[in-house]
Amino acid sequence: IVGGTNSSWGEWPWQVSLQVKLTAQRHLCGGSLIGHQWVLTAAHCFDGLPLQDVWRIYSGILNLSDITKDTPFSQIKEIIIHQNYKVSEGNHDIALIKLQAPLNYTEFQKPICLPSKGDTSTIYTNCWVTGWGFSKEKGEIQNILQKVNIPLVTNEECQKAYADAKIAQAMVCAGYKEGGKDACKGDSGGPLVCKHNGMWRLVGITSWGEGCARREQPGVYTKVAEYMDWILEKTQSSDGKAQMQSPA
């Protein structure tokens, strides 16, 4: 996160760290807890690393430097990448992770509510992006979970900023015209959440941007509302019954 500040314990209890253990262990992506056994993240996090057993998912964590060999983590039972995601395109950048064992909810580890299907009418004015990613383009992973308040921008505005790309309906953009605040490398897959009527909702999944926090280059996020049917279908067919946090 560029231009952010330290988060507090329990402030973003749905935020998880997706880490890979090969020879060493490192944080690669963020994710959002959306049910006892489900994490929502970006499909591109698994490019070149589709093997379930190399991944460790840490929840209820604020400071990555607190993680030791004794820190509990979740393992992956199943990775469900959106069927239309292609490495060559970058559209449909969304994936579900089914955990091997369900998590108990605590003050520091609980799910984020999902938006209503096809939610286009809600005007979100209080949106935040969180993650342990770089604090500048040529930076490094941060220890303490960072947060930054970023306004949504229209897809039309976003398309002007990215003339050589296609900003699809299933994407949502956020950023300041002057730059300075944004997600960055290592924040991929993490949440863009907005508070509306006193409730936090998962509006976007951190996907891509041209550099980080550059002027007139907003961050691009997968628009979760456009994938509600897919999320429900995959979690229900795998679970028998869904355990999602949908809005009341």
Partner: antibody
């Protein structure tokens, strides 16, 4: 199977014009940025131009700017290169290529993942 | 314009040997925008490596890419007879997109 098939090359006099076409199949053409790359006989590869998926955004190499125009017809899955005021130094094999733009570490990736077989353009009097 | 300089110009090696090809860029290039291509006589180029280190579909694991910033490397761990060709690095970080001048890997 992704296929790109160029056509329209041939012999043309200096100052003349030619229009190259590239017929695409096996993928959703309208989702991809497309590019032209050329290779003079016995020389290396030179990027010429690219066009955005919608066709609304184009960029050219300085060597062809103002003389060449890239365009596309997404309804026909076809990419074009209109070449005017041709010079001897434009003699080359012209390749069309698909530009893959995925995502890695929250940044786009960009690379030419499929190429046509090329069409030879010879500019000579 | 970002200039890509490949070295050596020609590499004379025997099958089974290791080939190390260098590509230096005149300005910083985000590694996501650095690719390597192989070209054989009379054929179109073929994508080998994208994002500086990711192998393209169907490319054997004897090909590997590495590097960041301004210094990138293509390594062929054990040359097979079909690997003798010209190799190009290419950047699409900034327009104009540019290629290196190529390294020819020939049989010694």
């Amino acid at each position: 199977e992704v296929q790109l098939l160029e056509s329209g090359g041939g012999l043309v006099q200096p100052g003349g014009s030619l229009r190259l076409s590239c017929a695409a199949s096996g993928f959703t053409f309208s989702h991809y940025l497309m590019t032209w790359v050329r290779q003079a006989p016995g020389k290396g590869l030179e990027w010429v131009s690219y066009i955005s998926p919608s066709g609304g955004h184009t960029i050219y190499a300085d060597s062809v700017k103002g003389r060449f125009t890239i365009s596309r017809d997404n309804s026909k899955n076809t990419l074009y290169l209109q070449m005017n005021s041709l010079r001897a130094e434009d003699t080359a094999v012209y390749y069309c290529a698909r530009v893959a733009r995925g995502i890695a570490a929250r940044s786009r990736t960009s690379y030419f993942d499929y190429w046509g077989q090329g069409t030879l353009v010879t500019v000579s009097s | 314009e970002i200039v890509l300089t490949q070295s050596p110009g020609t590499l004379s090696l025997s099958p089974g040997e290791r080939a190390t090809l260098s590509c230096r860029t005149s300005q910083f290039v985000n590694s996501n925008y650095l690719a390597w291509y192989q070209q054989k006589p009379g054929q179109a180029p073929r994508l080998l490596i994208y994002g500086a280190s990711s192998r393209a579909t169907g490319i054997p694991d004897r090909f590997s890419g590495s590097g960041s910033g301004t210094d990138f490397t293509l390594t062929i761990s054990r040359l097979e007879p079909e690997d003798f060709a010209v190799y190009y690095c290419q950047q699409s970080s900034r327009t104009p997109w540019t290629f290196g001048q190529g390294t020819k890997v020939e049989i010694k």
